[in-house]
């Protein structure tokens, strides 16, 4: 376990409580909210992070057109149910017994129903499109430099295997990062694209989940890359099931 040995903290998740009570007096960290032990050498799952957040005191050079089945997280924050591995349970319900089905990144993919609603399986989000607009700069970023820095960021900060960053598109001032990861491609120990995207989203908002004081410092050939808008689209292996009423609203 790689929580810092002396002051016993979790480098990859500040929303933890750590103490030297692991085997051999090693540092062990547990996520706030759920109390689940977390592996501080990798990203914590989005489900456990959302749960911790809810428990915390409140204070081609062409751009991709998201498919008709792409989901955007319009519902915002909720206190999720996580399984023993820290993944989202397929069915989520609130305190008033309103239930809905979610995908592997916790985004609602059905209409809301009651306790009789069935969600047979957790549907995997296999394609994530991160759409960014950067603040004005003296000139456009060099596309290959931008591509290299964003790939490096996902590989080194978010520990995502390089093969899962499918593409980086750029048409000033819009940047799009495509992450793709099928169930069959994801090996044991691989970071999930949904978790990487969530860490990135929080970093971009200046709400870093890492222990560090510094936050994300993203630069392209020394020029700071500052993001003013972020939209994230989620594509599931099975299209979502919404009523026509919602689709025409």
């Amino acid at each position: 376990h790689t929580a810092a040995q002396d002051n016993c903290t979790c480098p990859t998740n500040k929303m933890t409580v750590c103490s030297p009570d692991g085997p051999g007096g090693r540092c062990q960290c547990r996520a706030l909210g759920s109390g689940m032990a977390v592996d501080c050498s990798t990203l914590t799952s989005k489900c456990l992070l959302l749960k911790a957040r809810m428990s915390a005191p409140k204070n081609a050079r062409t751009l991709v057109r998201p498919s008709e089945h792409a989901l955007v997280d319009n519902d915002g924050l909720y206190d999720p149910d996580c399984d023993p591995e820290g993944r989202f349970k397929a069915r989520q319900c609130n305190q008033t017994s309103v239930c809905w089905c979610v995908n592997s990144v916790g985004v609602r993919r059905t209409d809301k129903g009651d306790l009789s609603l069935r969600c047979d399986e957790l549907v995997r989000t296999h394609h994530i499109l991160i759409d960014l607009r950067h603040r004005p700069t003296a000139g456009a970023f060099n596309h290959s430099d931008l591509d290299a820095e964003l790939r490096r960021l996902f590989r080194e900060r978010y520990r995502l295997h390089p093969k899962f960053v499918a593409a980086v598109h750029y048409e000033q001032p819009t940047i799009q990062i495509e992450l793709r990861q099928n169930t069959s491609q994801k090996a044991a120990g691989d970071v999930d694209i949904g978790d990487a995207a969530y860490y990135f989203e929080r970093d971009i908002k200046g709400e870093s989940l890492f222990q560090g004081r510094g936050g994300l410092d993203l630069r392209v050939r020394g020029e700071p890359l500052q993001v003013e808008r972020t939209l994230i689209y989620y594509l599931d292996e099975i299209p979502p099931k919404f009523s026509m009423k919602r689709l025409t609203a």
Epitope: D6, E156, H161, G189, D217
Partner: antibody
Framework: QVQLVESGGGVVQPGRSLRVSCAAS????????MHWVRQAPGKGLEWVAV????????DYVDSVKGRFTISRDNSKNTLYLQMNSLRGEDTAVYYC??????????????WGQGTLVTVSS | DIQMTQSPSSLSASVGDRVTITCRAS??????LAWYQQKPGKVPKLLIY???TLQSGVPSRFSGSGSGTDFTLTISSLQPEDVATYYC?????????FGGGTKVEIK
């Protein structure tokens, strides 16, 4: 060009202290985790310590814990290794190396030329 | 702590031969493995990271494979300039342990 230059090595008696430095240039030092690696004469590579890009996290190999301290000054683009209570087995060439981008743990893509530390009475 | 075991510790091969070096982690480390080359009297040089990604500027005769606990470095056609000691290293988390090294010589 991207460069790391170590300094401060030398001969020191057992039980004494020494501080080695590593000056970085050609890249944005404050965005990279940094490491110290050592190599005893005729032996293999041994990782010694890491400090994250923002100084928020440090880790050490068991054999130096409590004796060595890694630190950095991002305003000076410099990495340090303070070595106290030195022992004969600490004799080695000490390399600084660049690690992860906005992180700590990653492969080392840039190495310094090394500085020799000899612990002997 | 996770141990990294390299084999063989040394080998001798002819120019043009295919050379394979293996590295085994005592526990799974996903793809967080690097390979380095150190020529006599020189500084180590990164060859491969993330188990199989070739570092920029490294000749394509070098390749890496594996995931989890078993990893391989292959030199498809050994050249005289490849005489060196090769090290694997895990970098999933601290300690970032190196393997013991494999010394490659020309017959």
């Amino acid at each position: 060009q991207v460069q790391l230059v170590e300094s401060g090595g030398g001969v020191v008696q057992p039980g004494r202290s020494l501080r080695v430095s590593c000056a970085a240039s050609g890249f944005i030092f404050s965005t990279y985790g940094m490491h110290w690696v050592r190599q005893a004469p005729g032996k293999g590579l041994e990782w010694v310590a890491v400090i994250w890009y923002d100084g928020s996290n440090e880790d050490y190999v068991d054999s130096v814990k409590g004796r060595f301290t890694i630190s950095r000054d991002n305003s000076k683009n410099t990495l340090y290794l303070q070595m106290n209570s030195l022992r004969g087995e600490d004799t080695a060439v000490y390399y600084c190396a660049r690690g992860g981008y906005n992180s700590g743990w990653w492969a080392f893509d840039v190495w310094g030329q090394g500085t020799l530390v000899t612990v002997s009475s | 702590d996770i141990q990294m075991t390299q084999s063989p510790s040394s080998l001798s091969a002819s120019v043009g031969d295919r050379v394979t070096i293996t590295c085994r982690a005592s526990q799974g480390i996903s793809h967080f493995l690097a390979w380095y080359q150190q020529k006599p009297g020189k500084v180590p040089k990164l060859l491969i990271y993330a188990a199989s990604t070739l570092q920029s500027g490294v000749p394509s005769r070098f390749s890496g494979s594996g995931s989890g606990t078993d990893f391989t470095l292959t030199i498809s056609s050994l050249q005289p300039e490849d005489v060196a000691t090769y090290y694997c290293q895990k970098f999933n988390s601290a300690p970032l342990t190196f393997g013991g090294g494999t010394k490659v010589e020309i017959k």
